[in-house]
Interface confidence: low
């Protein structure tokens, strides 16, 4: 008799990452009988929702349902119908919504309300939409990359070696850059974490981890650019801002009302004698770098050592995975190779920023001008943040690995979030509260 293929006994989970600039839906899949094994969950689909981040829908909440339709329908196609009802759906909103909540808790709530109602209309097991904390975002990103790199596994592997994996079980640090915030998370070497807010303790697969994490709100690449513009326009004598972070020949008109719309620019806000100003690019990496450094207050530190703005940062330890916008920007600039030294990256950035805007547009004709125009700033910002903000050096630069995917799954907080909420990381209950959510509202 012929052997019939048994139906696949698998489970699925969906996580929506509602970021400041866009929303992405991730579908994960794992063998039902191996739920507690490490490394068995993998991503089968990513769907990028067309349009901006959900925080931009405050004035048009009625459009949220349509906005989410395509990707939710895609999930309906990818996941077998028989599995729909038992597939959990989680939506986590990050710094864009944290900023909106700072402006108005009511507005943030209204957006989440409509998101929840929209997602409840699908046949899945909707588990709630919430604004995750910066601490959670950092922690879940750290869990994701170490889970995918096999760092929590004590087994000898018979399958192909995971990229970046060494034989030791030392965890990787996680560097995450978004549009509105950036997170740094790692296990320091025998170092007391001097500020309790930055300390996480949890037990994963029978091992204890003391983890440092911090999320810098307003220091994602988009909000950092708004901050820089708000700072620089203060000293501009008229409504022309000659900006070294944009290519020579680049011009763009900015509304002052848009500049001051975000809470991130409040500290620079002043009454200006004009409603609009024009950015005129001059393309100078060194000057751009200097301007960015002014966003980091390094003169005050109440601890033994700090990153910036008085935030404790222990000495860097081990290898780091840099993902999300760290990866996307450096990938565009062709600087993700392990062989490219920090000095070489700086040299390449100098050349790139100095290229005339017309030349850049011709060379990258397929790229949207809005994104294309900001790569000089973003690349320079990444260097400034890593070197002066987090204190990486030319030597320790080689410990930064720019990672997009690991084993086919995107590096980011979503997988760690789902692993935690579906109780798929066996261990005693984590001691730290941010990673335990018993109820969703």
């Amino acid at each position: 008799t012929q052997n019939k293929a048994l139906p696949e006994n698998v489970k699925y989970g969906i996580v929506l990452d509602a970021g400041s600039s866009h929303t992405s839906l991730y579908i994960y899949k794992w063998p039902a009988e191996k739920e507690n094994d490490t490394g068995v969950v993998h991503q089968v689909e990513e769907c990028r929702v067309k349009g901006p981040g959900i925080s931009k829908f405050v004035q048009k909440v009625n459009e949220i349902g349509i906005y989410l339709t395509d990707c939710m329908e895609r999930a309906r196609e990818v996941i077998p119908r028989s599995q729909h009802q038992e597939t959990p759906v989680y939506l986590g909103a990050t710094a864009g919504m944290r900023l909106l909540r700072m402006e108005s808790e009511e507005l943030a709530d209204r957006v989440l309300d409509v998101v929840e109602r929209s997602l409840s209309n699908y046949p899945f097991d909707f588990q709630g939409a919430r604004i995750i904390t910066g601490q959670e975002e950092g922690a879940y990103g750290w869990i994701t990359i170490n889970y995918l790199l096999g760092k929590f596994s004590q087994k000898t592997r018979w399958f192909s070696i995971v990229p970046y994996e060494t034989n030791n079980q030392e965890t990787f640090g996680a560097l995450d850059l978004g549009g509105a915030s950036t997170q740094v998370t790692f296990v320091p070497q025998n170092q007391t974490i001097e500020s309790p807010d930055n300390a996480l303790q949890f037990r994963l697969y029978g091992k204890d981890y003391n983890v440092y994490t911090h999320s810098f709100l307003c220091y994602g690449k988009d909000q950092a650019l708004w901050q820089k513009l708000a700072k620089d326009i203060q000293v501009a004598s008229n409504e022309i801002l000659r900006d070294p972070c944009f290519h020579p020949g680049y011009k763009k008109v900015v509304n002052v009302s848009d500049l001051y719309k975000t809470p991130c620019t409040k500290r620079f806000e002043m009454t200006l004698p004009f409603q609009q100003f024009e950015i005129q690019g001059i393309g100078n990496y060194q000057q751009c770098h200097q301007s960015i450094l002014e966003l980091f207050n390094t003169s005050y530190c109440p601890y033994s050592q700090c990153a910036f703005n008085g935030i404790f940062l222990p000495p860097l330890q081990g290898d780091f995975g840099a993902f999300s916008a760290f990866y996307f920007v450096m990938k565009f600039l062709n600087l993700t190779s392990e062989k490219v030294s920090q000095e070489k990256v700086t040299e390449m950035m100098k050349k790139f920023c100095a290229q005339p805007w017309e030349e850049i547009k011709t060379s990258y004709a397929g790229v949207k001008e809005k994104y294309l125009s900001e790569y000089c700033f973003s690349g320079t910002y990444i260097l400034s943040l890593l070197l002066q903000g987090y204190h990486f050096t030319a030597d320790s630069w080689e410990h930064i690995h720019f990672i997009g995917k690991i084993q086919g799954s995107d590096a980011g907080w979503t997988l760690g979030y789902m692993l935690n909420l579906t109780n798929m990381i066996p261990a005693e209950q984590p001691l730290s509260t941010p990673l335990s959510h018993s109820t969703y509202v």
Epitope: E105, E106, L107, D109, T133, D197
Partner: antibody
């Protein structure tokens, strides 16, 4: 189900202080601000202020600055309000109410009576 | 501070009839195209209960006979048809800006 359980009634002397509590359950405590509202016979409802349980940041109604102090203990999911230098004007029912989703969840109230 | 003036101070309505309570704000409570006006019902010995949020959206589990309308500075709460259980104090509240403020309340009774 979201629940806010407030501490019992207090009888206090003029000039003294009182500290009341509000224990939250049924939701992630740090996801929502906790607001406090005063209900007295003559003046109806008055908003006192709120605290963000994530970082302990507070925003007060100017009228209650120096009168009320809001604090939280995230591990016990409890919010506290201390009222100082009490006078008969402070005799009222005080409610805690969860921020966001529009004050849909309220505690049962703590009655404070200031009397010599 | 935004002052909310509620009227009438008290109102008696026959069972099955319509009760209308008004609330006027000293300045607009609209922001981003949303009216930050709320209506609460409070019975003796109980905390306030949310009836209407964002001027016209019903709170969870609120009967359809409660409806809200208005924008900018003028708002109203309608109860129709009036039921015995609706005897209570009704308050409007704005949360457009700090300090959040409440109206002085309307006492609704059965005629």
């Amino acid at each position: 189900e979201v629940q806010l359980q407030q501490s019992g009634p207090e009888l206090v002397k003029p000039g003294a202080s009182v500290r009341m509590s509000c224990k939250a359950s049924g939701y992630t405590f740090t996801d929502y601000n906790m607001h406090w509202v005063k209900k007295n016979h003559g003046k109806g409802l008055e908003w006192i202020g709120y605290i963000n349980p994530n970082n302990g940041g507070t925003t007060y109604n100017q009228k209650f600055k120096g009168k009320a102090t809001l604090t939280v203990n995230t591990s016990s999911k409890t919010a506290y309000m201390e009222l100082r230098s009490l006078t008969s004007e402070d005799s009222a029912v005080y409610y805690c109410t969860r921020g966001g989703t529009r004050f849909a969840s309220w505690g049962q109230g703590t009655l404070v009576t200031v009397s010599a | 501070n935004i002052v909310l003036t509620q009227s009438p101070a008290s109102l008696a309505v026959s069972l099955g009839q319509r009760a209308t309570i008004s609330c006027r704000a000293s300045e607009s409570v609209d922001n981003y195209g949303i009216s930050f006006m709320y209506w609460f019902q409070q019975k003796p010995g109980q905390p306030p209960k949310l009836l209407i949020y964002a001027a016209s959206t019903q709170g969870s589990g609120v009967p359809a006979r409660f409806s809200g309308s208005g924008s900018g500075t003028d708002f109203s709460l309608n109860i129709h048809p009036m039921e015995e259980d609706d005897t209570a104090m009704y308050f409007c509240q704005q949360s457009k800006e700090v300090p959040f403020t409440f109206g002085s309340g309307t006492k609704l009774e059965i005629k």
